[in-house]
Structure formats: structure tokens, C-alpha cells
């Protein structure tokens, strides 16, 4: 089991202290109150890169 502060959860998931495991961020659309959903919204979107100068 992963402990908080060790290797991060895989992409698209976030650590739940209430469940002691990584949880799929997709479930936050149905149930946004879950504790791990805070971690899902914490990651900033990837920066937009222009393909030309």
C-alpha cells in the first residue's frame, strides 16, 4: 500500500486518506465530495505550446 508522501498515484488518480489507496479521478464527476478529489483538481493543466514562433 502506498503511504502519503511516497511515490505519487498514477496519472488520472489521486491519493485518498479516507480509503488509504489511490482512487480514479473520473469518479469525482459523480461524487465531488470525496477527499481525493482535491488532489485531482490540484494539478494544473498542461501548458499550451505554440507549434510555430
Amino acid at each position: 500500500e502506498q503511504a502519503p508522501g511516497t511515490a505519487p498515484c498514477s496519472h488520472g488518480s489521486s491519493w485518498s486518506a479516507d480509503l488509504d489507496k489511490c482512487m480514479d479521478c473520473a469518479s469525482c464527476r459523480a461524487r465531488p465530495h470525496s477527499d481525493f478529489c482535491l488532489g485531482c483538481s490540484a494539478a494544473p493543466p498542461a501548458p499550451f505550446r505554440l507549434l510555430w514562433p
Partner: antibody
Framework: EVQLLESGGGLVQPGGSLRLSCAAS????????MIWVRQAPGKGLEWVSY????????HYADSVKGRFTISRDNSKNTLYLQMNSLRAEDTAVYYC?????????????WGQGTLVTVSS | DIQMTQSPSSLSASVGDRVTITCRAS??????LNWYQQKPGKAPKLLIY???SLQSGVPSRFSGSGSGTDFTLTISSLQPEDFATYYC??????????FGQGTKVEIK
């Protein structure tokens, strides 16, 4: 066979303390979230407290916050509820229950309950 | 907090009757609704989870439906052992859960 067995209930005066225990058997205790639920005489079910599998995360109903403490000892397969500053309105049968194995969406096994009576 | 309201509070029925109990949430809880049966002096027993999934070992005469705010527990043909009190429980805000006030099913 999954079993949850509560103990520690009894008669206590207002302002007193009790410690309830819930001994688990028949399953691996450590991966499961657990809760305490109570039922006052002739009344419905009221959620009291939640604890995560490791014991690192706990939550309480407003009615008991600051007075009750939930804990667990995974090496002893036991859940606890320390109840302080007890009031007459805490009189109830207290049940422990096991959360579902993937989430805490539902509670699939319950103990038989232990009666706590707060009276002078 | 999400309030759960069951109706009726009690009902009288005969063996073989079709019985329907409703549970309404004060706001949408998607499908995060469970049903329990409790007999006097006994612990609650899980019947239905996530609105419509039958718990293992529960007879198929029990069924659940609904989503959002309105949910139903149906007993297709009431049996003598079904006389009990039934509770709904929302898990949308888990681990902060709430129960309905209960529906007592009595013998007519």
C-alpha cells in the same frame, strides 16, 4: 464467517466515560474502513464515526465531535470508540459495521450491538 | 447535510402482497443509495447497495430502483420473515452518511 462483536456498553452517569470495542473475525480486518452507528431506544439509525483502514483518517458526527474518539488496532483486529463527557442523549445501542471492499458506499456486516445507558 | 425522507413511516400488509417503500433525498445523490432491513433486537442487514444491486444472499423478491433524489425498495411478494423496519442510507457524501427515519412493515 465474518463476525463483529461489540462489547464495553453499560450504565454510566452523565459526564462519565466508556470505551466500546468491536472484535472482528472471519476476514482480514486491515483493508476495511469501519464505522460506528447508534440507535436510541425506539428511534432510527444515526451515523457516529468513521475510520480509514490504516486509522489515519477519522470523521465524526457533529453530535459527538470533541467527545468521542474512534481508533483501531489492526494487529488485534479490533475497533474502538472512546466516549467521554457522556450525555443522556447518547443513550443508545451502538453498532460497529464494515465498509465495502472497494469504497465506503455500503456497510455489509454489522455487529449485534452494545447498549450504552447514560443516567444518574 | 443531506436529509433522507422515507414514506410511508409504517404500513400494514399481508403475506403475498407487493410492497413499495420510497426514499427521497434533499438533493441529488446520483445512485449512492443503500437499503437495510432491521428486525427487533437485531442489527441492520444490507439488502440493496448502489440503488439497485442485490447484496449476496438476499432473496430476489427484493429490488431497488431510482437515481437522483427519488428511490424505491420493492418487495414483490411479502413473506412472513420480511416484517421488519427498512432504512435507506445515502453514501453520496461518504464517509458522512445519513439514514432515512425508517419504514416499519407490519402484519395486516
Amino acid at each position: 464467517e465474518v463476525q463483529l462483536l461489540e462489547s464495553g456498553g453499560g450504565l454510566v452517569q452523565p459526564g462519565g466515560s466508556l470505551r466500546l470495542s468491536c472484535a472482528a473475525s472471519g476476514f482480514t480486518f486491515s483493508p476495511y474502513p469501519m464505522i460506528w452507528v447508534r440507535q436510541a431506544p425506539g428511534k432510527g439509525l444515526e451515523w457516529v464515526s468513521y475510520i480509514s483502514p490504516s486509522g489515519g483518517s477519522t470523521h465524526y458526527a457533529d453530535s459527538v465531535k470533541g467527545r468521542f474518539t474512534i481508533s483501531r488496532d489492526n494487529s488485534k483486529n479490533t475497533l474502538y470508540l472512546q466516549m467521554n463527557s457522556l450525555r443522556a442523549e447518547d443513550t443508545a445501542v451502538y453498532y460497529c459495521a464494515r465498509g465495502g471492499d472497494t469504497y465506503f458506499d455500503y456497510f455489509d456486516y454489522w455487529g449485534q450491538g452494545t447498549l450504552v445507558t447514560v443516567s444518574s | 447535510d443531506i436529509q433522507m425522507t422515507q414514506s410511508p413511516s409504517s404500513l400494514s400488509a399481508s403475506v403475498g402482497d407487493r410492497v413499495t417503500i420510497t426514499c427521497r433525498a434533499s438533493q441529488s445523490i446520483s445512485g449512492y443509495l443503500n437499503w437495510y432491513q432491521q428486525k427487533p433486537g437485531k442489527a441492520p442487514k444490507l439488502l440493496i447497495y448502489q440503488a439497485s444491486s442485490l447484496q449476496s444472499g438476499v432473496p430476489s423478491r427484493f429490488s431497488g430502483s431510482g437515481s437522483g433524489t427519488d428511490f424505491t425498495l420493492t418487495i414483490s411478494s411479502l413473506q412472513p420473515e420480511d416484517f421488519a423496519t427498512y432504512y435507506c442510507q445515502q453514501s453520496y457524501t461518504s464517509p458522512f452518511i445519513t439514514f432515512g427515519q425508517g419504514t416499519k412493515v407490519e402484519i395486516k
